[in-house]
């Protein structure tokens, strides 16, 4: 029997190589029962996570999960960095895994590195 | 219910490649990760590496990097491993490995594939 | 590498008697988020392998109560607390934390 209880399914460890100057969405997959939960997203900052505030986001329902979206439009240089979604949920504090957008500045876009080079750098895949 | 349906046996060449499919159903195959695992004839396990089919990233142990290559087609909810430049020691079972929403868990395993390199 | 080093190699266990695996990492498997990514894996002869264990001690669904997983840090144990001819195989420990994931050697089980 699945549980009621609200989970945040942003995959562990994932990645996301991303261009400035492109628009993106970040997305953090809901699953709930019956209240859609008051979802917020923040961005790591060493070991405290800052709520983001001012930012546009939005949601996506699909069949069996709801996505609450963390707009980038543009991608700027400095949103390099980790993100997490977390949801209230019965007086809980619910928190996804972190995912990690690493950021590409367009002026060095025709050096930029393709997915399997980001993978084999010895400093994104080991911590 | 989650269900990793592997490609057949293959009977490969030193020097030559092969390329592996795993079609998923059951679950929402972006929203996982797709691992592959291999086993050489009466020995252990090792991970060959991961993709992420929402985005094509992907991670590989170092001693595969290069050689192997990960790719994924959310259309037909399909992974593939690409192994190119075979020897003999790549003669192996390899199985494709999905997880629960991106737990990197390892949950469900396919029936596995039997590589064979030899000249 | 975090190196996975298992023991025994082997074991050959009576029926009904108790049988235990250790597994030591070569690095404290607690991540950042307060987890511990170590699994155990069974695979019986001529299968694929299957999840057995979870985060070092939660038992998956459809898993005999007979085996647990205890453990923290660099150390874990796999214990099956009665042994039955269908345990025979090769048993697995694995460690998610950092990349590239690592498997144990393995340690085969057999039934006198």
């Known amino acids: 029997k699945e549980s009621c209880d609200v989970q945040l399914y942003i995959k562990r460890q994932s990645e996301h190589s991303i261009l400035a100057g492109d628009p993106f969405e970040l997305e953090c997959p809901v699953k709930y029962c019956a209240n859609r939960p008051h979802v917020t997203w923040c961005k790591l900052n060493g070991t405290t996570c800052v709520k983001l505030e001012d930012r546009q986001t939005s949601w996506k329902e699909e069949k069996n999960i709801s996505f609450f979206i963390l707009h980038f439009e543009p991608v700027l240089p400095n949103d390099n960095g980790s993100y997490r979604c977390s949801a209230n949920f019965q007086s809980n504090l619910i928190e996804s895994h972190s995912t990690t957008l690493y950021v590409t500045d367009v002026k060095s876009a025709s050096e930029r590195p393709s997915k399997d080079e980001m993978a084999s750098r010895p400093w994104l895949l080991y911590r | 219910q989650v269900q990793l349906v592997q490609s057949g046996a293959e009977v490969k060449k030193p020097g030559a490649s092969v390329k592996l499919s795993c079609k998923a159903s059951?679950?929402?195959?972006?929203?996982?990760?797709a691992h592959w695992v291999r086993q050489a004839p009466g020995q252990g396990l090792e991970w060959i590496g991961r993709?992420?089919?929402?985005?094509?990233?992907?991670k590989y142990d170092p001693k595969f990097q290069g050689r192997a290559t990960m790719t994924a087609d959310t259309a037909s909810n399909t992974a593939y491993l690409e192994l190119s430049s075979l020897r003999s020691e790549d003669t192996a079972v390899y199985y494709c490995?999905?997880?629960?929403?991106?737990?990197?868990?390892?949950?469900?395993w396919g029936q596995g594939t039997l590589v064979t390199v030899s000249s | 590498d975090i190196v996975m080093t298992q023991t025994p190699l082997s074991l050959s266990v009576t029926p009904g008697q108790p049988a235990s695996i250790s597994c030591k990492s070569s690095?404290?498997?607690?991540?950042?988020?307060?987890?511990?990514?170590l699994n155990w894996f069974q695979q019986r002869p001529g299968q694929s392998p299957r999840r057995l264990m979870h985060?070092?001690?939660k038992l998956d669904s459809g898993v005999p109560d007979r085996f647990s997983g205890s453990g923290s840090g660099t150390d874990f144990t796999l214990k099956i607390s009665r042994v039955e001819a269908e345990d025979v195989g090769v048993y697995y420990c694995?460690?998610?934390?950092?990349?590239?994931?690592?498997f144990g050697q393995g340690t085969k089980l057999e039934i006198k």
């Open positions: 490995v999905a997880d629960h929403y991106g737990s990197s868990l390892l949950d469900y």
């Open positions: 059951g679950y929402n195959f972006k929203h996982t990760y």
């Open positions: 993709i992420d089919p929402a985005n094509g990233n992907t």
């Open positions: 690095q404290s498997l607690l991540d950042s988020d307060g987890k511990t990514y």
């Open positions: 985060l070092v001690s």
């Open positions: 694995w460690q998610g934390t950092y990349f590239p994931y690592t």
